[in-house]
Structures are given as C-alpha cells and as structure tokens.
Amino acid sequence: QPNNSLMLQTSKENHALASSSLCMDEKQITQNYSKVLAEVNTSWPVKMATNAVLCCPPIALRNLIIITWEIILRGQPSCTKAYKKETNETKETNCTDERITWVSRPDQNSDLQIRTVAITHDGYYRCIMVTPDGNFHRGYHLQVLVTPEVTLFQNRNRTAVCKAVAGKPAAHISWIPEGDCATKQEYWSNGTVTVKSTCHWEVHNVSTVTCHVSHLTGNKSLYIELLPVPGAKKSAK
C-alpha cells in the first residue's frame, strides 16, 4: 500500500503586483462631493502583495492649510505624516515603514500609497484636511487579505484532509459529496488562520471527493480519488 499521506494536490494563487485604489477622478469629485464627506470611514479589503492608494477627501488643494495622514497599525505607535502648505514643509512622527509614502509631492497629490501591501499594514488610516471652511477627514479600515495555500490528501482509508493554510480572513471549506466531517481552525500570531477539515465517507460508491475552499481572494477546488477499503476486492455497481 503506498503512502497516501503525501500531499497529492496543492494550490497557491499567484498575483501579479496589482494596484487598487478607492480614489475618484475629477468628474466623480464634483458629483459625489457631499456623499463622500458624509462617508467618513470605509472598510477596505486589499490583497497582500498588491499596491494600494488611499485618498483624502476631494478638497481642492488651493483651499488647503494642512494635510495630515494618521496611521494606526497594530502594536505600533501612531504614525503621522503632515504637510503644511504655507511653509511647503512635510513632517513625519513615529513612521518607520518605508513602503507607506505620499504618492508624489503632497503639494500636488495628497494621496497615500502602500507599496507591496503586507500583513503588517492591517490598520486604520485617516486623512485630515484643514481648510478655512473647517476640517474634513476620511478614514480607511484596511483589511489585508492573504490567499490561503490549499492542500488535499488522504491520511487513512476513505478519509481525506483539506487544509487552507495561513489565509486571512479564515477560509470556508465545503465538500462534494458531504461526508462525516470535523473542522478545526488554528490562529497564527500574524493574523492568518489555518482551517483544516477532515472527512470520512462510509458510502462505498463515493469514488472521488472534492474540497471547495471559499475565500475573499477567490475560490479553489481540489479533488482526490478515495482509496479502497482494505480487503475489499470486488464489487458490482
């Protein structure tokens, strides 16, 4: 009998370095000005290893006094990046991550960019714009998404194990056909979760089982033919 505890199928999605942004063009700014100002906070899921651009409220830069980006990351002191228009000076406080920068010169573009988003970029980002008409702010709860690595293998007769390793948030595992299943979740210190589903199929006409992993970054299915019951030689179907 071969060792069928070997990993039979694996999957890891590869993403080219993509960019995502919630910024709006000039036309949208005029159309949605009041709406955007009302929507102060936005939850924003972003795939790990992509680039992200975060935007300030759509205020014309000519009306500006000060722009401040406040960045609150887990386990770190609050970082602020400020630009004062009158003196054309920028100032940073407690900012150590070199991947979080102004998109360009803040006097030309107030947007913030994160190059190659990592799990550590999970957190709250807020742009505060001080103008003669008052203060306007826009916040982002940035949720970094991590694609789980999916594996499917057999560890004993008519029992299969499907794992979605180190996903963020936790993946959901389902099976075709449904079996007698137990699911466990393991939480890691970096915020990722490993989900492990172990199923057994007593019904002998089940030939192949399919593990379907659902995740915010995309879905993945793997299948495997079940081993025969030990000692079973012949059966008519």
């Epitope: 069928n4 030939s207 192949t208 299915s221 495997i224 033919e225 081993l227």
Partner: antibody, heavy 114, light 107 residues
Framework: QVQLVQSGAEVKKPGASVKVSCKAS????????MHWVRQAPGQGLEWIGN????????NYDEKFQGRVTMTVDTSTSTAYMELSSLRSEDTAVYYC???????WGRGTLVTVSS | DIQMTQSPSSLSVSVGDRVTITCQAS??????LHWFQQKPGKAPKLLIS???NLEDGVPSRFSGSGSGTDFTFTISSLQPEDIATYYC?????????FGQGTKLEIK
Amino acid sequence: QVQLVQSGAEVKKPGASVKVSCKASGHTFTSYWMHWVRQAPGQGLEWIGNIYPGSGSINYDEKFQGRVTMTVDTSTSTAYMELSSLRSEDTAVYYCLTMTGTSWGRGTLVTVSS
Amino acid sequence: DIQMTQSPSSLSVSVGDRVTITCQASQGTPINLHWFQQKPGKAPKLLISGASNLEDGVPSRFSGSGSGTDFTFTISSLQPEDIATYYCLQFTYIPWTFGQGTKLEIK
C-alpha cells in the same frame, strides 16, 4: 507526464474472449485507480469498471458483471481488461484511463464478428 | 446511478459563434465533472477538469462553470478546429457516467 500505451486491435468471434492491455508510465502505478471505458461505433462513452493496482480492489458496472475481469501486473505497471462471452454489440474501442480520468490511452478497437 | 443529462445533443454552428453546452446530474446529487472533446477516430481529450479548470495548452476560448448539479461548458468564439463531439463525465460516484455527447456541425 503520464503515458498509457494500449495493445493493438483485435478481431474475435462471438462467444470468445479478449484481453486488452494498458502499460502505464510517468506516475506511481500502484497509487492511482485505473479505469476502463468503451465506445461502440457512433455511440457515446460507457464506463466498464476500475481497479486499484495497490491492492487489487475492483469495481465493475453491473452491466458487465460476470463477463469482465480486471487485473494488474505491478512489476510491469500494466493493467488488463478481459471481456468474455463476446457478442457483436461488444464491438467498440476500449480505453484505459487514470489520474481521475485526466490521462487516457489511445484506445484498442475490438471487433466481434462471425 | 447518477445520470448525466447533456444538452443539446447536436448543434449547428458557424465560425465565431458562442457555443454553450449544459450537463445536469440526476437525483439532485452534487457531483464534480470533466469536459472532453472528441474528434473522429481519436481518444477523448480533456479540456476542463474539475468543472472549471482549463487544462494546460487548451485555448482560453474554452471555459467551464457551475457546481452542485448544473454545469456549463462554453466556447466563446468557435474556431474551425473546434468541430467535434463534447462530453461531460461525472467522477464523484461509481459508476462514473458520461453525458450523451453534443455533436457540433457546421451550418
């Protein structure tokens, strides 16, 4: 890359038996089920049964029960499908397939004619 | 046994057409399946494995979708070399069962 090489065409008389072979390479022969499928001229595909080379465990479609015998020779990574009491309606191309149906042999034409 | 109802059984097509073939599993039983292309005198060729995974070397105009009991195979823009018979195969339950096939013919 998995390769399945099947034996050559056969012409048989009604009532006789035929044994088709399928030699596998490129994967662990004993770790994957081997399936047999047939296709009569101008017709669709029909599953005959499967065998697990690692243990000799077999499943036959009940339509073929009593007439079909599947065996393996693990020393040569070869699977065999024998069909007995042949009749004209058994005239078909017989295929072996493995890796959950993703790798197929080229087929063996069996003609049953008096 | 799970019966696979494949439709249509034949289709008259032109180059550039969008072609859609469906397979439905009987008894409301969720299954997984493959899609094959077969040309006269040749063994079936796997195009789509596990309902939606395009096999290596298969042109991207071929696609598969669906889950549970209802599945769809699509050719986005038919090419002359796509004239063939197409089959679905459910491999979740023994006996494995094929759809009846869909034969494409040029108009």
